[in-house]
Interface confidence: low
Protein backbone atom coordinates (compact mmCIF):
# COMPACT_ATOMS: atom_id res chain seq x y z
CA UNK A 1 0.00 0.00 0.00
CA UNK A 2 1.12 3.54 -0.71
CA UNK A 3 2.64 5.35 2.28
CA UNK A 4 3.90 8.84 2.94
CA UNK A 5 7.07 9.11 4.98
CA UNK A 6 7.24 12.52 6.58
CA UNK A 7 10.01 14.10 8.60
CA UNK A 8 10.73 15.54 11.05
CA UNK A 9 8.08 14.57 13.60
CA UNK A 10 8.59 17.80 15.51
CA UNK A 11 10.88 20.80 15.27
CA UNK A 12 11.42 23.92 17.34
CA UNK A 13 12.57 26.99 15.43
CA UNK A 14 12.98 30.66 16.33
CA UNK A 15 10.87 33.39 14.78
CA UNK A 16 12.27 34.39 11.41
CA UNK A 17 14.02 31.08 10.79
CA UNK A 18 13.22 28.37 8.25
CA UNK A 19 12.05 24.78 8.51
CA UNK A 20 12.30 21.86 6.09
CA UNK A 21 9.50 19.30 5.84
CA UNK A 22 10.16 16.26 3.68
CA UNK A 23 7.41 14.14 2.17
CA UNK A 24 8.53 10.87 0.56
CA UNK A 25 6.41 8.31 -1.25
CA UNK A 26 7.00 5.25 -3.40
CA UNK A 27 5.67 7.09 -6.43
CA UNK A 28 2.51 6.75 -8.47
CA UNK A 29 0.84 9.87 -7.14
CA UNK A 30 -0.83 12.75 -8.88
CA UNK A 31 0.46 15.48 -6.63
CA UNK A 32 1.00 16.41 -3.02
CA UNK A 33 -0.58 18.83 -0.59
CA UNK A 34 0.97 20.20 2.56
CA UNK A 35 -1.92 20.83 4.90
CA UNK A 36 -1.95 22.63 8.23
CA UNK A 37 -4.20 20.72 10.57
CA UNK A 38 -6.68 22.19 13.02
CA UNK A 39 -10.39 22.77 13.37
CA UNK A 40 -10.30 24.34 9.91
CA UNK A 41 -7.58 22.47 7.99
CA UNK A 42 -5.74 24.76 5.62
CA UNK A 43 -3.94 23.75 2.45
CA UNK A 44 -0.55 25.46 2.42
CA UNK A 45 0.75 24.24 -0.93
CA UNK A 46 -0.15 21.97 -3.79
CA UNK A 47 2.84 20.55 -5.69
CA UNK A 48 2.80 18.53 -8.87
CA UNK A 49 5.76 17.77 -11.10
CA UNK A 50 5.82 20.00 -14.18
CA UNK A 51 3.18 22.38 -12.83
CA UNK A 52 3.69 25.75 -11.15
CA UNK A 53 3.15 25.06 -7.43
CA UNK A 54 0.15 26.67 -5.78
CA UNK A 55 0.90 28.42 -2.48
CA UNK A 56 -1.52 29.87 0.02
CA UNK A 57 -1.41 33.65 0.27
CA UNK A 58 -0.16 33.51 3.84
CA UNK A 59 3.00 31.67 2.72
CA UNK A 60 3.51 33.28 -0.66
CA UNK A 61 7.16 34.31 -1.01
CA UNK A 62 8.09 32.19 2.00
CA UNK A 63 8.05 28.71 0.44
CA UNK A 64 10.73 26.88 -1.53
CA UNK A 65 10.61 23.38 -3.01
CA UNK A 66 13.31 20.89 -3.82
CA UNK A 67 13.13 17.39 -5.25
CA UNK A 68 10.10 15.95 -6.98
CA UNK A 69 6.57 15.11 -5.92
CA UNK A 70 7.75 11.61 -4.94
CA UNK A 71 10.43 12.99 -2.63
CA UNK A 72 9.59 16.60 -1.91
CA UNK A 73 11.27 18.92 0.56
CA UNK A 74 9.23 21.99 1.42
CA UNK A 75 11.08 24.87 3.06
CA UNK A 76 9.05 27.45 4.93
CA UNK A 77 10.96 30.68 5.53
CA UNK A 78 10.60 33.65 7.89
CA UNK A 79 8.43 31.71 10.30
CA UNK A 80 5.99 33.60 12.50
CA UNK A 81 4.44 32.56 15.80
CA UNK A 82 1.14 32.06 13.99
CA UNK A 83 2.83 29.41 11.80
CA UNK A 84 3.02 27.12 14.84
CA UNK A 85 0.99 24.03 14.15
CA UNK A 86 0.94 20.56 12.67
CA UNK A 87 1.62 20.15 8.96
CA UNK A 88 0.84 16.93 7.16
CA UNK A 89 1.67 15.76 3.66
CA UNK A 90 -1.28 14.45 1.67
CA UNK A 91 -0.42 12.34 -1.35
CA UNK A 92 -3.07 12.42 -4.05
CA UNK A 93 -3.48 8.86 -5.24
CA UNK A 94 -6.46 6.61 -5.90
CA UNK A 95 -6.82 6.57 -2.14
CA UNK A 96 -5.47 9.71 -0.50
CA UNK A 97 -2.64 8.96 1.93
CA UNK A 98 -1.32 11.11 4.75
CA UNK A 99 2.04 11.54 6.40
CA UNK A 100 2.38 11.27 10.15
CA UNK A 101 2.59 15.05 10.52
CA UNK A 102 5.24 17.56 11.53
CA UNK A 103 4.66 19.70 14.60
CA UNK A 104 6.35 23.05 14.05
CA UNK A 105 6.85 25.08 17.22
CA UNK A 106 7.85 28.65 16.42
CA UNK A 107 9.49 30.42 19.34
CA UNK A 108 11.15 33.70 20.14
CA UNK A 109 14.90 33.26 20.02
CA UNK A 110 15.46 34.15 23.64
CA UNK A 111 12.78 31.75 24.83
CA UNK A 112 13.74 28.80 22.65
CA UNK A 113 14.87 26.77 25.63
CA UNK A 114 11.36 26.91 27.03
CA UNK A 115 9.80 25.07 24.09
CA UNK A 116 10.37 21.37 23.82
CA UNK A 117 9.36 18.74 21.31
CA UNK A 118 8.13 15.43 22.61
CA UNK A 119 9.59 12.18 21.30
CA UNK A 120 6.36 10.86 19.86
CA UNK A 121 5.17 11.70 16.36
CA UNK A 122 2.49 14.40 16.44
CA UNK A 123 -0.20 12.07 15.11
CA UNK A 124 -0.83 8.50 14.13
CA UNK A 125 -0.26 7.99 10.42
CA UNK A 126 -3.86 6.88 9.91
CA UNK A 127 -5.28 10.39 9.79
CA UNK A 128 -8.94 10.99 9.18
CA UNK A 129 -9.58 12.53 5.81
CA UNK A 130 -9.97 16.29 6.12
CA UNK A 131 -12.87 17.93 4.34
CA UNK A 132 -12.64 17.65 0.57
CA UNK A 133 -11.36 20.61 -1.35
CA UNK A 134 -9.40 23.47 0.18
CA UNK A 135 -10.67 24.21 3.65
CA UNK A 136 -10.98 27.86 4.59
CA UNK A 137 -8.51 29.01 7.21
CA UNK A 138 -9.45 31.37 9.99
CA UNK A 139 -10.15 34.77 8.44
CA UNK A 140 -7.11 36.31 10.10
CA UNK A 141 -4.64 34.21 8.20
CA UNK A 142 -5.48 33.96 4.53
CA UNK A 143 -7.93 33.01 1.87
CA UNK A 144 -8.35 29.39 0.82
CA UNK A 145 -5.68 27.87 -1.35
CA UNK A 146 -6.74 28.11 -4.99
CA UNK A 147 -7.62 24.86 -6.66
CA UNK A 148 -4.75 23.15 -8.45
CA UNK A 149 -4.62 23.67 -12.22
CA UNK A 150 -7.47 22.07 -14.14
CA UNK A 151 -5.07 19.67 -15.81
CA UNK A 152 -4.47 18.09 -12.45
CA UNK A 153 -7.99 18.38 -11.07
CA UNK A 154 -8.54 16.04 -8.18
CA UNK A 155 -10.93 13.11 -8.53
Amino acid sequence: AQEVQQSPHCTTVPVGASVNITCSTSGGLRGIYLRQLGPQPQDIIYYEDGVVPTTDRRFRGRIDFSGSQDNLTITMHRLQLSDTGTYTCQAITEVNVYGSGTLVLVTEEQSQGWHRCSDAPPRASALPAPPTGSALPDPQTASALPDPPAASALP
Epitope: P39, D83, T107, C117
Partner: antibody, heavy 119, light 107 residues
Framework: DVQLQESGPGLVKPSQSLSLTCTVT?????????WNWIRQFPGNKLEWLGY???????SYNPSLKSRISITRDTSKNQFFLQLNSVTTEDTATYYC????????????WGQGTSVTVSS | DILLTQSPAILSVSPGERVSFSCRAS??????IHWYQQRTNDSPRLLIK???ESISGIPSRFSGSGSGTDFTLNINSVESEDIADYYC?????????FGPGTKLELK
Protein backbone atom coordinates in the same frame (compact mmCIF):
# COMPACT_ATOMS: atom_id res chain seq x y z
CA ASP B 1 -18.76 20.65 24.45
CA VAL B 2 -15.26 20.88 25.91
CA GLN B 3 -15.13 21.34 29.66
CA LEU B 4 -12.08 21.91 31.84
CA GLN B 5 -11.90 21.60 35.61
CA GLU B 6 -8.97 22.43 37.86
CA SER B 7 -8.27 20.70 41.14
CA GLY B 8 -5.54 20.73 43.75
CA PRO B 9 -4.68 21.86 47.26
CA GLY B 10 -5.85 25.31 48.24
CA LEU B 11 -2.94 25.88 50.61
CA VAL B 12 0.75 25.32 49.97
CA LYS B 13 3.66 26.14 52.23
CA PRO B 14 6.51 28.35 51.01
CA SER B 15 9.42 26.45 49.37
CA GLN B 16 7.15 23.50 48.63
CA SER B 17 5.75 22.47 45.23
CA LEU B 18 2.35 23.43 43.94
CA SER B 19 0.66 20.68 41.94
CA LEU B 20 -2.60 21.19 40.08
CA THR B 21 -4.68 18.98 37.79
CA CYS B 22 -6.88 19.99 34.88
CA THR B 23 -9.42 17.36 33.91
CA VAL B 24 -10.80 17.73 30.39
CA THR B 25 -14.14 16.26 29.36
CA UNK B 26 -15.81 16.30 25.97
CA UNK B 27 -12.58 16.21 24.00
CA UNK B 28 -9.38 14.16 23.95
CA UNK B 29 -6.32 16.20 24.84
CA UNK B 30 -4.32 14.06 22.39
CA UNK B 31 -6.53 14.96 19.43
CA UNK B 32 -5.63 18.61 18.92
CA UNK B 33 -5.04 21.99 20.53
CA UNK B 34 -2.77 23.50 23.14
CA TRP B 35 -3.73 23.06 26.78
CA ASN B 36 -2.68 26.08 28.82
CA TRP B 37 -2.22 27.17 32.40
CA ILE B 38 -2.90 30.79 33.33
CA ARG B 39 -3.02 32.40 36.75
CA GLN B 40 -4.70 35.48 38.13
CA PHE B 41 -3.12 37.26 41.04
CA PRO B 42 -4.98 39.11 43.79
CA GLY B 43 -5.62 42.43 42.12
CA ASN B 44 -6.65 40.55 38.95
CA LYS B 45 -3.46 40.60 36.87
CA LEU B 46 -3.43 37.62 34.46
CA GLU B 47 -0.24 35.70 33.64
CA TRP B 48 0.16 32.92 31.06
CA LEU B 49 2.28 30.12 32.50
CA GLY B 50 2.67 27.65 29.66
CA TYR B 51 1.03 24.95 27.60
CA UNK B 52 1.24 21.32 26.64
CA UNK B 53 0.15 20.49 23.10
CA UNK B 54 -1.87 17.50 21.97
CA UNK B 55 1.41 15.81 21.02
CA UNK B 56 3.01 16.40 24.42
CA UNK B 57 5.22 19.32 23.38
CA UNK B 58 5.53 22.07 25.96
CA SER B 59 6.25 25.77 26.18
CA TYR B 60 6.72 27.80 29.35
CA ASN B 61 6.80 31.43 30.37
CA PRO B 62 10.51 32.28 30.81
CA SER B 63 9.65 34.38 33.88
CA LEU B 64 9.12 31.14 35.78
CA LYS B 65 12.66 30.03 34.97
CA SER B 66 13.12 26.38 35.80
CA ARG B 67 10.35 26.19 38.40
CA ILE B 68 7.58 25.07 36.07
CA SER B 69 6.64 21.75 34.54
CA ILE B 70 3.50 20.85 32.59
CA THR B 71 2.79 17.17 32.04
CA ARG B 72 -0.22 15.01 31.23
CA ASP B 73 -1.89 11.66 31.77
CA THR B 74 -3.53 10.76 28.49
CA SER B 75 -5.37 7.77 29.97
CA LYS B 76 -7.23 10.09 32.34
CA ASN B 77 -7.45 12.99 29.88
CA GLN B 78 -5.74 15.23 32.39
CA PHE B 79 -2.85 17.65 32.30
CA PHE B 80 -0.90 18.98 35.23
CA LEU B 81 0.94 22.03 36.49
CA GLN B 82 3.85 21.72 38.87
CA LEU B 83 5.45 24.86 40.24
CA ASN B 84 8.43 24.34 42.50
CA SER B 85 9.91 26.46 45.30
CA VAL B 86 6.77 28.52 45.69
CA THR B 87 6.64 31.81 47.57
CA THR B 88 3.78 34.00 48.69
CA GLU B 89 4.07 35.68 45.28
CA ASP B 90 2.60 32.53 43.74
CA THR B 91 -0.69 33.04 45.58
CA ALA B 92 -3.29 33.26 42.81
CA THR B 93 -6.28 31.67 41.15
CA TYR B 94 -5.03 29.13 38.62
CA TYR B 95 -6.95 28.44 35.43
CA CYS B 96 -6.53 25.85 32.72
CA UNK B 97 -7.64 26.85 29.24
CA UNK B 98 -7.70 25.52 25.69
CA UNK B 99 -6.39 27.28 22.60
CA UNK B 100 -5.59 26.40 19.03
CA UNK B 101 -1.91 25.84 18.31
CA UNK B 102 -0.60 28.89 16.51
CA UNK B 103 -3.68 30.94 17.31
CA UNK B 104 -3.49 31.33 21.10
CA UNK B 105 -6.92 32.78 21.84
CA UNK B 106 -8.19 30.94 24.91
CA UNK B 107 -11.66 29.81 23.93
CA UNK B 108 -12.48 27.46 26.81
CA TRP B 109 -11.51 28.02 30.46
CA GLY B 110 -11.89 26.06 33.65
CA GLN B 111 -13.62 27.61 36.63
CA GLY B 112 -10.29 28.25 38.38
CA THR B 113 -8.85 27.03 41.65
CA SER B 114 -7.57 29.33 44.36
CA VAL B 115 -4.11 28.60 45.76
CA THR B 116 -2.69 30.37 48.79
CA VAL B 117 0.98 30.10 49.64
CA SER B 118 1.39 30.61 53.36
CA SER B 119 3.15 29.04 56.29
CA ASP C 1 7.87 40.93 26.62
CA ILE C 2 5.11 42.89 24.92
CA LEU C 3 3.40 45.22 27.37
CA LEU C 4 -0.31 45.86 27.01
CA THR C 5 -1.89 48.90 28.63
CA GLN C 6 -5.63 49.37 29.00
CA SER C 7 -7.46 52.59 29.61
CA PRO C 8 -9.31 53.76 31.49
CA ALA C 9 -8.97 51.56 34.55
CA ILE C 10 -12.66 52.05 35.33
CA LEU C 11 -15.54 52.96 33.02
CA SER C 12 -18.87 54.09 34.43
CA VAL C 13 -21.85 53.78 32.11
CA SER C 14 -25.61 53.75 32.07
CA PRO C 15 -27.56 50.89 30.49
CA GLY C 16 -28.09 51.45 26.77
CA GLU C 17 -24.96 53.55 26.33
CA ARG C 18 -22.21 52.72 23.86
CA VAL C 19 -18.88 52.03 25.50
CA SER C 20 -15.34 51.63 24.17
CA PHE C 21 -12.38 49.94 25.82
CA SER C 22 -8.83 50.73 24.73
CA CYS C 23 -5.83 48.42 24.60
CA ARG C 24 -2.40 49.65 23.51
CA ALA C 25 0.60 47.44 22.75
CA SER C 26 4.21 48.43 23.40
CA UNK C 27 5.09 47.45 19.81
CA UNK C 28 3.21 46.67 16.62
CA UNK C 29 1.40 43.34 16.85
CA UNK C 30 -0.70 43.33 13.69
CA UNK C 31 -4.14 42.12 14.67
CA UNK C 32 -2.96 39.51 17.19
CA ILE C 33 -5.12 40.76 20.05
CA HIS C 34 -7.94 38.97 21.85
CA TRP C 35 -10.56 40.32 24.24
CA TYR C 36 -12.00 38.63 27.32
CA GLN C 37 -14.82 39.40 29.71
CA GLN C 38 -14.62 38.32 33.34
CA ARG C 39 -17.65 38.72 35.56
CA THR C 40 -17.24 38.69 39.34
CA ASN C 41 -16.30 35.24 40.64
CA ASP C 42 -16.25 33.83 37.12
CA SER C 43 -13.63 32.71 34.60
CA PRO C 44 -12.58 34.86 31.66
CA ARG C 45 -14.67 34.40 28.54
CA LEU C 46 -13.38 34.99 25.01
CA LEU C 47 -15.33 37.80 23.32
CA ILE C 48 -13.32 38.73 20.24
CA LYS C 49 -10.27 37.12 18.67
CA UNK C 50 -7.73 38.65 16.31
CA UNK C 51 -8.93 42.21 16.95
CA UNK C 52 -12.27 41.91 15.17
CA GLU C 53 -13.29 38.27 14.68
CA SER C 54 -16.55 37.42 16.39
CA ILE C 55 -16.97 34.38 18.62
CA SER C 56 -19.91 32.00 18.40
CA GLY C 57 -22.37 32.59 21.22
CA ILE C 58 -21.19 36.13 21.99
CA PRO C 59 -23.89 38.81 21.57
CA SER C 60 -23.55 40.93 18.45
CA ARG C 61 -23.36 44.11 20.52
CA PHE C 62 -19.68 43.26 21.12
CA SER C 63 -17.27 44.25 18.37
CA GLY C 64 -13.57 44.92 18.04
CA SER C 65 -11.28 46.94 15.82
CA GLY C 66 -7.72 48.11 15.45
CA SER C 67 -4.33 46.96 14.24
CA GLY C 68 -0.70 47.73 14.94
CA THR C 69 -0.58 49.10 18.46
CA ASP C 70 -4.06 50.49 19.15
CA PHE C 71 -7.14 48.32 19.65
CA THR C 72 -10.72 48.95 20.71
CA LEU C 73 -13.49 46.78 22.09
CA ASN C 74 -16.95 48.26 21.69
CA ILE C 75 -20.28 47.43 23.31
CA ASN C 76 -22.88 49.26 21.29
CA SER C 77 -25.63 49.16 23.93
CA VAL C 78 -24.55 48.16 27.41
CA GLU C 79 -26.72 45.76 29.36
CA SER C 80 -26.53 45.09 33.09
CA GLU C 81 -25.07 41.63 32.43
CA ASP C 82 -22.05 43.31 30.78
CA ILE C 83 -20.81 44.61 34.12
CA ALA C 84 -17.45 42.90 34.38
CA ASP C 85 -13.72 43.29 33.91
CA TYR C 86 -12.40 43.33 30.34
CA TYR C 87 -8.92 42.16 29.36
CA CYS C 88 -6.90 42.15 26.16
CA UNK C 89 -4.25 39.54 25.33
CA UNK C 90 -1.56 39.50 22.66
CA UNK C 91 -0.47 36.37 20.80
CA UNK C 92 2.24 37.53 18.43
CA UNK C 93 5.17 37.12 20.79
CA UNK C 94 6.22 34.83 23.62
CA UNK C 95 5.32 34.91 26.36
CA UNK C 96 1.63 35.51 25.82
CA UNK C 97 0.69 38.57 27.85
CA PHE C 98 -2.51 40.19 29.10
CA GLY C 99 -3.48 43.77 29.75
CA PRO C 100 -4.27 44.92 33.30
CA GLY C 101 -7.97 45.14 32.56
CA THR C 102 -10.73 47.73 32.57
CA LYS C 103 -13.59 47.51 35.04
CA LEU C 104 -17.03 48.35 33.67
CA GLU C 105 -19.48 49.59 36.28
CA LEU C 106 -22.93 51.12 36.29
CA LYS C 107 -23.40 54.80 37.09
Amino acid sequence: DVQLQESGPGLVKPSQSLSLTCTVTGYSITSDYAWNWIRQFPGNKLEWLGYISYSGSTSYNPSLKSRISITRDTSKNQFFLQLNSVTTEDTATYYCAKSQLGRWAMDYWGQGTSVTVSS
Amino acid sequence: DILLTQSPAILSVSPGERVSFSCRASQSIGTSIHWYQQRTNDSPRLLIKYASESISGIPSRFSGSGSGTDFTLNINSVESEDIADYYCQQSISWPLTFGPGTKLELK
